[in-house]
Interface confidence: low
């Protein structure tokens, strides 16, 4: 059955209740110079509008503090209102390493990120940090790497490893959950000139992730004891016509091309899914495509296999798919899939269908295919036009969390966290935020607060209290480090 009745019950005490933000652009300077500048100024407000130093007056100064960053104050205010236990945000690779290598490290950017993490910890909010979050407008790569063919160049994977090592070294004492790359399986939207470009870029992204994971595993895990994975875009697929075999096959093929493409090599075999490889090869044989998945060497298979500590999925909706034979040598046509927009379904302004039961099906599919592992939903949300009473978002959150709870209670899926997407919306982008672009809170925040404080949807008389030892204590030593390690 697709929809089943709501359940009453709670998520475990160590469940991560999170909110996700995309790339945080670091502020270059703390915005409170008065604390480091001992001079007093008067503002000539009516004349030349300049600040004029008052001679002979000296003020007490104090060391710079994290909260001198205006941006961080805003972040913290929003996070405090969210009542989450975890905050997922992404670093800006291009800001941290403008040259793409370790020859010019932007220490100020790292200090800013360290401040975000340490100030969050003071509020009891742990960070899940994403190292690389490509956006469709811009790949988010340092310029020199972008100009050297980006992800089509294998050396970008080595550059990523060096960058990851720097971040582990600088932030790893405070950060215990890492995402190397956000949605590498959607970079097909950018590297789409040909299927071979798409598969070549994907291959280098896989290698980049694996190199970073193995570096962490060997050099940093023993002392930092964190966990590393990558986040896959993981929408569910259903046959548009449940009575057509070809539609069922198309739905499974969508999952193979979208999720298994990255999950199979990392979680399971070290190689691409046989179903995907065979499908592309059969199209190749019939002259319908000149695409080919890269052939992995023994060494590459061993490099990739097993390089995840947990499964991280970004899930937003369910797609309704049908088979349609497409010619052309591009990733989109290699799949032979056509999407159907079901206008009878509740949908968002950007046409994202609200299909709560899809997330439960996804979680079961992942467990069936890749085994019983810890799973985090690292982004899940909907766009809602309302600037105050965002009822669609409240409905979405309630229903999707219900299905996640069913997966936990009934299907026994090891679901460890849910991160709602996203903290604040950006101007002129679809409205996914709990806060508007000028930081006004929406009513879905109270709804999410209530679910978090109840740990789900408890029976009337059940306690939502957790003992301190049961709660998420992944960073008990972090607060001590925040005080002791200089920023």
């Amino acid at each position: 059955k697709e929809s089943t009745p709501d359940v009453q019950g709670q998520f475990p005490c160590d469940f991560s209740w999170g909110v996700t933000e995309s790339v945080l652009k670091p502020e270059s300077v703390a915005s409170s110079p008065q604390f480091s500048d001992p001079h007093l100024y008067v503002w000539n407000a009516t004349g030349n509008r300049l600040l004029h130093r008052v001679e002979g007056v000296r003020l007490k100064t104090r060391p710079a503090q994290c909260t001198d960053f205006v941006n961080i104050k805003k972040q913290l205010e929003m996070l405090a209102r969210m009542k989450v236990t975890h905050y997922r945000f992404a670093l800006d690779w291009a800001s941290v390493l403008p040259t793409g290598n370790l020859s010019a490290v932007n220490r100020q950017a790292l200090r800013y990120y360290r401040c975000v993490v340490s100030e969050g910890l003071k509020l009891g909010i742990s960070a899940m940090v994403t190292l690389y979050y490509p956006t469709h407008a811009h790949l988010g790569l340092p310029e020199p790497l972008l100009h050297a063919d980006g992800w089509l160049n294998p050396s970008t994977a080595e550059a990523f490893q060096a960058y990851a090592g720097l971040c582990f070294q600088e932030l790893g004492d405070l950060v215990k959950l890492w995402i190397t790359i956000n949605e590498p399986n959607r970079l097909s939207d950018i590297y789409n000139r040909s299927g071979n470009d798409t598969y070549g870029a994907a291959h280098n992204l896989l290698v980049a992730h694996a190199l970073a994971w193995r570096l962490y595993d060997r050099q940093f895990r023993p002392s930092q004891r964190g966990a590393v994975s990558l986040s896959l875009h993981a929408d569910w697929a259903e046959p548009a016509n449940p009575y057509a075999d070809s539609h069922w096959r198309a739905a499974e093929r969508f999952l193979q091309f979208e999720i298994a493409w990255f999950a199979e090599p990392l979680f399971k075999t070290g190689d691409y899914p046989a179903a995907m490889r065979e499908y592309i090869a059969s199209k190749h044989r019939r002259g319908l495509s000149s695409s080919a998945l890269p052939r992995l060497t023994e060494a590459e298979r061993r490099l990739l296999k097993g390089t995840v500590d947990f499964c991280a999925l970004n899930h937003f909706t369910t797609r309704f798919v049908m088979h349609e034979q497409l010619a052309g040598s591009r990733y989109d046509s290699d799949r032979d899939i056509q999407f159907l927009q079901d206008i009878t379904r509740l949908s968002s302004p950007t046409r994202l269908a609200v299909i709560p039961w899809g997330v439960r099906k996804l979680l079961r599919w992942v467990r069936r295919n890749y085994g019983d592992m810890d799973i985090y939903i690292t982004a899940s949300g909907i766009d809602d036009q309302a600037l105050e009473d965002d009822r669609l978002r409240k409905y979405y959150l309630g229903k999707y969390l219900q299905e996640v709870l069913k997966a936990y209670l009934i299907d026994k899926v090891r679901i460890k966290g849910y991160y709602a997407f996203k903290l604040a919306e950006e101007k002129s982008k679809p409205r996914f935020g709990f806060f508007t672009s000028d930081f006004k809170a929406k009513s879905s925040i109270q709804f999410y607060n209530k679910v978090i404080s109840s740990r789900g949807f408890p029976f009337e008389n059940s306690s939502s209290r957790c003992s301190q030892t049961q709660e998420n204590t992944e960073c008990t030593v972090c607060l001590f480090l925040v005080q002791k390690k200089p920023l």
Epitope: A157, A210, A299, G306
Partner: antibody, heavy 120, light 111 residues
Framework: QVQPQESGPELVKPGALVKISCKAS????????INWVKQRPGQGLEWIGW????????KYNEKFKGKATLTADKSSSTAYMQLNSLTSENSAVYFC?????????????WGQGTLVTVSA | DIVLTQSPASLAVSLGQRATISCRAS??????????MHWYQQKPGQPPKLLIY???NLESGVPARFSGSGSGTDFTLNIHPVEEEDAATYYC?????????FGGGTKVEIK
């Protein structure tokens, strides 16, 4: 300390078999290949094969198929190599070595070696 | 199988001078931007010790006087300046495909 601990020297008769062990510690045993390497006295190094304890998959050098059998026990974090139908050609020091974190298949951590002597 | 040929078989070097060891593969051991060639040092009665991985990367804890270079079929290990403790046999090893193979070794003596 990640260095694997190998079992002690073995003196065995021709035609017999021997099983040598390699105990891992200081890391997650199921995440890395354990390789076995042979070195005859005064000679070079020969790769025998690897076992991946995560799923107990194995790969052998064709030259050692039928001669060496690689196994692993996850509960004790120990890898084993059994050599059968021993002849004087099999007298050698046998090393176990853990592969590195790069997937480059270089061997970072080596056991101290087990000397196997085949003699009547 | 890929055959690795090391030269010279032995080498006597004065303290403080440069030692250069070559390793030639019967076919390319490079792919996808990586060269799957590694170098080890072995002293009598001890297991080999990894010095260089993926052709040119210095293993942690290994002195910077060791360096590796090369791609495709030709690879070189350099030691400069040579020190007393560098007297040992050096092996190259590839991991491009199965079976992994080692070179025959180069014995370095200090004059």
């Amino acid at each position: 300390q990640v260095q694997p601990q190998e079992s002690g020297p073995e003196l065995v008769k021709p035609g017999a078999l021997v099983k040598i062990s390699c105990k891992a510690s200081g890391y997650t045993f199921t995440r890395y290949d354990i390789n076995w390497v042979k070195q005859r006295p005064g000679q070079g190094l020969e790769w025998i094969g690897w076992i991946y304890p995560g799923d107990i998959s194995t790969k052998y050098n064709e030259k050692f198929k039928g001669k060496a059998t690689l196994t692993a026990d996850k509960s004790s974090s120990t890898a084993y190599m059994q050599l059968n139908s021993l002849t004087s050609e099999n007298s050698a020091v046998y090393f176990c070595a853990r592969s590195d974190y790069y997937g480059s298949r270089s061997f970072v951590y080596w056991g101290q070696g087990t000397l196997v002597t085949v003699s009547a | 199988d890929i055959v690795l040929t090391q030269s010279p078989a032995s080498l006597a070097v004065s303290l403080g001078q440069r030692a250069t060891i070559s390793c030639r593969a019967s076919k390319s051991v490079s792919t996808s931007g990586y060269s799957y060639m590694h170098w080890y040092q072995q002293k009598p009665g001890q297991p080999p010790k990894l010095l260089i991985y993926l052709a040119s990367n210095l293993e942690s804890g290994v002195p910077a006087r060791f360096s590796g270079s090369g791609s495709g079929t030709d690879f070189t290990l350099n030691i400069h300046p040579v020190e007393e403790e560098d007297a040992a046999t050096y092996y190259c090893q590839h991991s491009r495909e199965l079976p992994y193979t080692f070179g025959g070794g180069t014995k370095v003596e200090i004059k």
